[in-house]
Amino acid sequence: ARNGDRCPLGPGRCCRLHTVHASLEDLGWADWVLSPREVQVTMCIGACPSQFREANMHAQIKMNLHRLKPDTVPAPCCVPASYNPMVLIQKTDTGVSLQTYDDLLAKDCHCV
Amino acid sequence: ARNGDRCPLGPGRCCRLHTVHASLEDLGWADWVLSPREVQVTMCIGACPSQFREANMHAQIKMNLHRLKPDTVPAPCCVPASYNPMVLIQKTDTGVSLQTYDDLLAKDCHCV
């Protein structure tokens, strides 16, 4: 039976949401973002073994072909399934503005 | 200047659409799909160097953090940006049906 959320490689090894603490300098934003000065970046990291959090039919195909032709076809990859918005205070040509970014922080993850 | 479509690793090395010829047996579909017997599977394969086909702000962040912490944060990954639908003739409990799958064949690719 398929169990799309149990990691066969051991706890925490498979595709999941991780938080990485980063400064504006780390992100390359220091010259245009005023705030926040530090960001808890949520991103998708981990392995995508067979049937683990498969996003769609394409991911199933990719895994099957990867097993057949590992040198040609890579395994599915852990990427965001959805995002959390974030608001930044940034410098603009006209001054300072608040800007919402919808695709900045991963909310949950799957394998594609 | 940013050039999101020029591969710095050489032609064909970066994230792009590839076609892989596969049989139903290769795909693990032989027991439930009647036709087609063979599929030209389009999928996204290749490296995601800095600024190449970045899908969104998250991809930019991921690349910047990957450069800082390569052991912790993986590089962005080449995945479908959109899909082409495909119709399969398949066996069902009641006989045979035509079924459209919207997420089976990659149409174009980007780095996330």
Partner: antibody
Framework: QVQLVQSGAEVKKPGATVKVSCKAS????????MSWVRQAPGQGLEWMGY????????VYAQKLQGRVTMTTDTSTSTAYMELRSLRSDDTAVYYC?????????????WGQGTLVTVSS | DIQMTQSPSSVSASVGDRVTITCRAS??????LAWYQQKPGKAPKLLIY???SLQSGVPSRFSGSGSGTDFTLTISSLQPEDFATYYC?????????FGGGTKVEIK
């Protein structure tokens, strides 16, 4: 704990200038920006402007443009709000409020408030 | 500027009552809405940020919901210390703007 302590009440004549201070403690001052908000007697809250405590960049409410200046002194972890050409309708309690660590456009904590009375 | 309209302007309620306050933005603000509580002679206090996230130390009887233009603050079971004025504030663009306030009074 995080605290914002403001200067004391002021009585000013119309046309004068007032400068209110806001001393921060309990966090790294230049890591989070500061807004100023005022509240006229019996009225609601009115945002006056924002200053980046890191860079000094400011944005002011349109109606106060030209009369208000916000500054900071990172050496003393203090933010200042100066309002010029005072009028009677500037009588209000003035608050400094730090941007929240969770969301930059939410305000937490707030100073205790400084009453500025403009009267001839 | 984004206008914030709060309703009702006042509500009379008893201890233990469920109280709901609404806030409407004149244009979409995603989920960038904060709620504050203010007691007489005191500074406002942040209760909810990002529409539904409870600020640390705030009792769980307070909750927020909504996105886009329509938002709600709910006090599930009113306590004596909850009688105060509540303000919403949009944080999607400068200038930051507040609703007119809702006074929660003892019935």
């Amino acid at each position: 704990q995080v605290q914002l302590v403001q200067s004391g009440a002021e009585v000013k004549k119309p046309g004068a200038t007032v400068k209110v201070s806001c001393k921060a403690s309990g966090y790294t001052f230049d890591s989070l920006g500061m807004s100023w908000v005022r509240q006229a007697p019996g009225q609601g809250l009115e945002w006056m402007g924002y200053i980046s405590t890191y860079s000094g960049d400011t944005v002011y409410a349109q109606k106060l443009q030209g009369r208000v200046t916000m500054t900071t002194d990172t050496s003393t972890s203090t933010a200042y709000m100066e309002l010029r050409s005072l009028r009677s309708d500037d009588t209000a309690v003035y608050y400094c409020a730090r941007e929240s660590g969770q969301q930059v456009s939410a305000l937490d904590p707030w100073g205790q408030g400084t009453l500025v009375t403009v009267s001839s | 500027d984004i206008q914030m309209t709060q309703s009702p302007s006042s509500v009379s309620a008893s201890v233990g009552d469920r109280v709901t306050i609404t806030c409407r933005a004149s244009q979409g603000i995603s989920r960038w809405l904060a709620w504050y509580q203010q007691k007489p002679g005191k500074a406002p206090k942040l209760l909810i940020y990002a529409a539904s996230s409870l600020q640390s130390g705030v009792p769980s009887r307070f909750s927020g919901s909504g996105s886009g233009t329509d938002f709600t603050l709910t006090i599930s079971s009113l306590q004596p210390e909850d009688f105060a004025t509540y303000y919403c504030q949009q944080g999607a663009s400068f200038p930051l703007t507040f609703g007119g306030g809702t006074k929660v009074e003892i019935k």
